[in-house]
């Protein structure tokens, strides 16, 4: 059976996996794969270590801890809903059927939608033909629809307000405190 871990779209997911090296530097190969652990090896390998190094990895997948100390926990960067599913961490201990296998179920939740700041809402109400979208992650955008009846002063003020609200939202997403 698999153990469940959760992350939110746009966050990094952390899938813990550890082993104790028999002696310092006496490392064993480890593989991470997408899908439950098969009888041997890992299916759909996303990362692999050998007795010395991380010798295979794919983009967005990395080891956060020090694998030389037995910390082979996997980090998946900037997750999407497609990253949901079961992951296999396999500690490839020498000998017949000695491998330690961990099936970890990653559940990705949609990102929390934060209501836009009041000032931005006021401007949206004042200029109903303006469309504002609040995205998540690197592809986040804010888009203006056509604004034929707004003069240059209003557009300038509006741009400043949008910039300020974007900055506030970005700070909030980073966990910073807005004073």
């Amino acid at each position: 059976s698999e153990v469940e871990y959760r992350a939110e779209v746009g966050q990094n997911a952390y899938l813990p996996c550890f082993y104790t090296p028999a002696a310092p530097g006496n490392l064993v190969p480890v593989c991470w794969g997408k899908g439950a652990c098969p009888v041997f090896e890992c299916g759909n390998v996303v990362l692999r270590t050998d007795e010395r190094d991380v010798n295979y990895w794919t983009s967005r997948y990395w080891l956060n801890g020090d694998f030389r100390k037995g910390d082979v926990s996997l980090t998946i960067e900037n997750v999407t809903l497609a990253d949901s599913g079961i992951y296999c961490c396999r500690i490839q201990i020498p000998g017949i059927m000695n491998d330690e296998k961990f099936n970890l179920k990653l559940v990705i939740k949609p990102a929390k939608v934060t209501p836009a700041p009041t000032r931005q809402r006021d401007f949206t109400a004042a200029f109903p033909r303006m469309l504002t979208t609040r995205g998540h992650g690197p592809a986040e955008t804010q888009t203006l629809g056509s604004l034929p009846d707004i003069n240059l002063t209003q557009i300038s003020t509006l741009a400043n307000e949008l910039r300020d609200s974007r900055l506030a939202n970005d700070l909030r997403d980073s966990g910073a405190t807005i004073r």
Epitope: V3, E4, Y5, Y14, P16, F18, T20, P21, P24, G25, G65, D66, R68, K69, G70, D71, F102, L104
Partner: antibody
């Protein structure tokens, strides 16, 4: 034989700083994470933080961020804990321990820190 | 932070008894749980790691079980030298956290 030898008891004034040391024998500290744990009299164990002496990566418990500073010197095989802005709340026994990698398999004998005017 | 709730906080038992201490994690920690014994005036000593693995030199009357959020430490055939405080600890997420401890005394 694996051993962690900690520095002796300290009596310090409020507001001062102190540096506690932990010297390892029987293993090389760069091969392990080195941790510090606090225990107040008749109370439980509190994890302060850990250092990876191989690359000086340090993690602190939020409560001890700004209070504790962890360092390691691989040439002398010693890990150290500096505590600043001391108050009576810092009076405790401080243990160093090594981990393999997520549990503490060897502990130092502890250093008693007393903060008093 | 992951909270570790340990119960009972104190326990009185007779020599030869079997006792059980439980530890509950506030979120999933898989099997990344350890148990320690601290005798009065002494340093903590590792008993069990990875929820159920006995550390070298620990008597077989100690055993651990559980996974995800619920864990137990069992001491069978209680001996006088088992008088101590027992702590659980999760090692999955930083900050590492300990249970509040269970003080075991002999009746």
């Amino acid at each position: 034989e694996v051993q962690l030898q900690q520095s002796g008891a300290e009596l310090v004034r409020p507001g001062a700083s102190v540096k506690l040391s932990c010297t390892a024998s029987g293993f090389n500290i760069k091969d392990y994470y080195m941790h510090w744990v606090k225990q107040r009299t008749e109370q439980g164990l509190e994890w302060i933080g850990r250092i990876d002496p191989d690359n000086d990566e340090i993690k602190y418990a939020p409560k001890f961020q700004g209070k504790a500073t962890l360092t390691a010197d691989t040439s002398s095989n010693t890990a150290s804990l500096q505590l600043s802005g001391l108050t009576s709340e810092d009076t405790a026994v401080y243990y160093c321990a090594r981990s393999s990698p997520y549990y503490f398999d060897y502990w130092g004998q502890g250093t008693t820190l007393t903060v008093s005017s | 932070d992951i909270q570790m709730n340990q119960s009972p906080s104190s326990l009185s038992a007779s020599l030869g008894d079997t006792i059980t201490i439980t530890c509950h994690a506030s979120q999933n920690i898989n099997v990344w749980l350890s148990w320690y014994q601290q005798k009065p005036g002494n340093i903590p000593k590792l008993l069990i790691y990875k929820a159920s693995n006995l550390h070298t030199g620990v008597p077989s009357r100690f055993s651990g079980s559980g996974s995800v959020t619920g864990f137990t430490l069992t001491i069978s055939s209680l001996q006088p030298e088992d008088i101590a405080t027992y702590y659980c600890q999760q090692g999955q997420n930083i900050p590492y956290t300990f249970g509040g401890g269970t003080q075991l005394e002999i009746k």
